[in-house]
Interface confidence: medium
């Protein structure tokens, strides 16, 4: 476009800027070691240090590990972002009794209101159930909290919570069958055997039934409870949440009890091929500064279960310089892929191929 020439010319001779044809404007060139936070940075504050996956840039400008939510009594509330840690909270049916930075050190099961009492305030991830005396017209046999919610005044006794600790856990607090064993497992989290991290564990075809809170006789408030990184689908089956562990993806919404995690392309990339709750193929914004572009290579490792599709090269983009070396500095046009998990096989010898689910749980790979 001839009308763009004056704008383009203003970039030439200014080593701190380059011209971006896609947005038709001058962009600030991030110094070596810094990464653009947007497609066309305008000023130094639009550049930042880049951290590896599962790390975030803290206030002191250091890459710091995001907290993990791998204990089975925790779920991810907000994902690990470039400038903030992952946040964990107690999973449904539990509340936090001892908080920790971005997480909870100790979760307890929501208590069940005893006979003659009804739920005034249902338990949340932060607070236990609050009970109050039942109205005279309400039958004490009405055990289901959902069916017993009637406004009433009076004192509000706090029901005694069921702690998640070896001393107080008991199998009677919830059904124990299938692969879940949540009552005992939740109890064992603080004393877990060193080589059995909760994020790498038992494949389970039947995750079992667990209530949102311990389920009294006659209660309708029992739903199937899935293991971490699984959700209850419309058919009532525990289904693995999608994984955003490919590093051209970021988590948009976390894995919840009734909905999958959703992934989207990370900043600086757009989705070329969509997939359920995710993107099968992210490509960099189609912009290139000829002197700084690295042509993305195909990632093809045929014997692995998770295979990142090849990244498309963009129009008007020059390939890597003759020697093929990627420079140690970055430019606004390079993809934001860091350490993407295209290959996910456990470092253990097995006779059958073993792959990892989004949780890192081994699953036999039939293919």
């Amino acid at each position: 476009f001839p009308q763009d020439r004056p704008f383009e010319d203003t970039c030439h001779g200014n080593p701190s800027h380059y011209y971006d044809k896609a947005v038709r404007r001058c962009c600030y060139r991030c110094p070596m070691g810094l990464f653009p936070t947007q497609q066309c940075p305008q000023r130094p504050t639009d550049c930042r240090k880049q951290c590896e996956p599962d790390y975030y840039l803290d206030e002191a400008d250091r890459c710091t590990a995001c907290v993990t939510c791998s204990r089975d009594d925790l779920v991810e509330k907000t994902p690990c972002a470039w400038n903030s840690s992952r946040v964990c909270e107690c999973r449904p049916g539990m509340f936090c009794s001892t908080s920790a930075v971005n997480s909870c050190a100790r979760c307890f099961f929501h208590s069940v209101c005893p006979a003659g009492m009804i739920v005034k305030f249902p338990g949340t991830a932060q607070k236990n159930t609050v009970c109050e005396p039942a109205s005279p017209g309400v039958s004490p046999a009405c055990a289901s909290p959902e069916n017993c919610k009637e406004p009433s005044s009076g004192t509000i006794p706090q029901a005694k919570p069921t702690p998640v600790s070896p001393a107080t856990s008991s199998a009677s607090t919830m059904p124990v069958r299938g692969g879940t064993r949540l009552a005992q497992e939740a109890a064992s989290k603080l004393t877990r055997a060193p080589d059995s991290p909760s994020s790498v564990g038992r494949p389970s075809s039947d995750p079992g039934l667990s209530p949102t809170q311990p389920c009294p006789e006659g209660s309708g408030d029992c739903r199937k409870q899935c293991e971490p990184d699984y959700y209850l689908d419309e058919a009532g089956r525990c289904t693995a949440c999608v994984s955003c562990s490919r590093d051209d993806l970021v988590e948009k919404t976390p894995c919840a009890w009734n909905s999958s995690r959703t992934c989207e392309c990370r900043p600086g990339m757009i989705c070329a091929t969509s997939a359920t709750n995710s993107c099968a193929r992210c490509v960099p914004y189609p912009i290139c500064a000829a002197e700084t572009v690295t042509k993305p290579q195909d990632m093809a490792e045929k014997d692995t279960t998770f295979e990142a599709p090849p990244l498309g090269t963009q129009p008007d983009c020059n390939p890597t310089p003759e020697n093929g070396e990627a420079p140690a500095s970055t430019s606004p046009t390079q993809s934001l892929l860091v350490d993407s998990q295209a290959s996910k096989t456990l470092p253990i010898p097995t006779s059958a191929p073993v792959a990892l689910s989004s949780t890192g749980k081994p699953v036999l790979d039939a293919g």
Epitope: G33, F35, Q50, C51, E52, P53, D54, Y55, D58, R62, C63, T64, A65, V67, T68, S70, R192, P194, P197, S199, V200, D229, S245, D247, T294, P296, Q297, M299, A300, E301, T304, A308, A326, P327, A328, S329, T330, Q334, S335, L336, L337, V338, D339, S340, Q341, A342, S343, K344, L346, P347, L356, S358, T359, G360
Partner: antibody, heavy 123, light 107 residues
């Protein structure tokens, strides 16, 4: 099988330069960051730098920023550590290592290491 | 930078002994600590990650514990092949740092 092999070490005079190579095999090179860790004779381990072969992004221990530069050649599955203005105290075995991919979280501990290459800075 | 201080710097023990090595961080590192074993002329080998999780193939006599600032590597019953130097590493915050090492020698 994941394998990392360093080369390029040797004797160099103070103020001189050297480029170390780390040839990777057994995994998709662009999938993992490659780190450099060094160990002076009879001393402990010291993290130097890492390179993301996919984007070319690097980060450094402040002690080495400016003198050391990491790069990668994706077509050769090789990472490099360019060391300039070498001093006697840079004498060490230099290892390249690959970060973990284990379980749900991807943190930077090292299950895979090369055998190391010795760099001696002496006049 | 986060400093890791290992103690003792060296110790002598016999086959069958129970040995404990500690690693103290200068600030909270959560459970983001790994332990390595290194033999002369060889690269380090990871034993423990996330403070207490044994890496695949590591014998069960090795165990790790701790969180925050204090971490421990325990070898429950020393075997001849365990005589080596042990390092802790924090991967909580960059730059990544290692302890100065603990040399385990035969008594």
């Amino acid at each position: 099988e994941v394998q990392l092999q360093e080369s390029g070490g040797g004797l160099v005079q103070p103020g001189g330069s050297l480029r170390l190579s780390c040839a990777a095999s057994g995994f998709t090179f662009t999938t993992y960051t490659i780190h450099w860790v060094r160990q002076a004779p009879g001393k402990g381990l010291e993290w130097v730098s890492y390179i993301n072969p996919s984007s070319g992004y690097s980060d450094y221990n402040q002690n080495f920023k400016g003198r050391f530069t990491t790069s990668a050649n994706k077509s050769k599955n090789t990472a490099y550590l360019q060391m300039n203005s070498l001093r006697a105290e840079d004498t060490a075995v230099y290892y390249c290592a690959r970060r973990a991919d284990y379980g749900n979280y991807k943190y930077t501990w090292f299950p895979y290491w090369g055998q190391g290459t010795l760099v001696t800075v002496s006049s | 930078d986060i400093e890791l201080t290992q103690s003792p710097s060296s110790l002598s023990a016999s086959v069958g002994d129970r040995v404990t090595i500690t690693c103290k961080a200068s600030q909270n590192v959560g459970t983001n600590v790994a332990w390595y074993q290194q033999k002369p002329g060889k690269a380090p080998k990871v034993l423990i990650y996330s403070a207490s999780y044994r890496y695949s193939g590591v014998p069960s006599r090795f165990s790790g514990s701790g969180s925050g600032t204090d971490f421990t590597l325990t070898i429950s019953s020393l075997q001849p092949e365990d005589f080596a130097t042990y390092y802790c590493q924090q991967y909580h915050t960059y730059p990544l740092t290692f302890g100065q090492g603990t040399k385990l020698e035969i008594k």
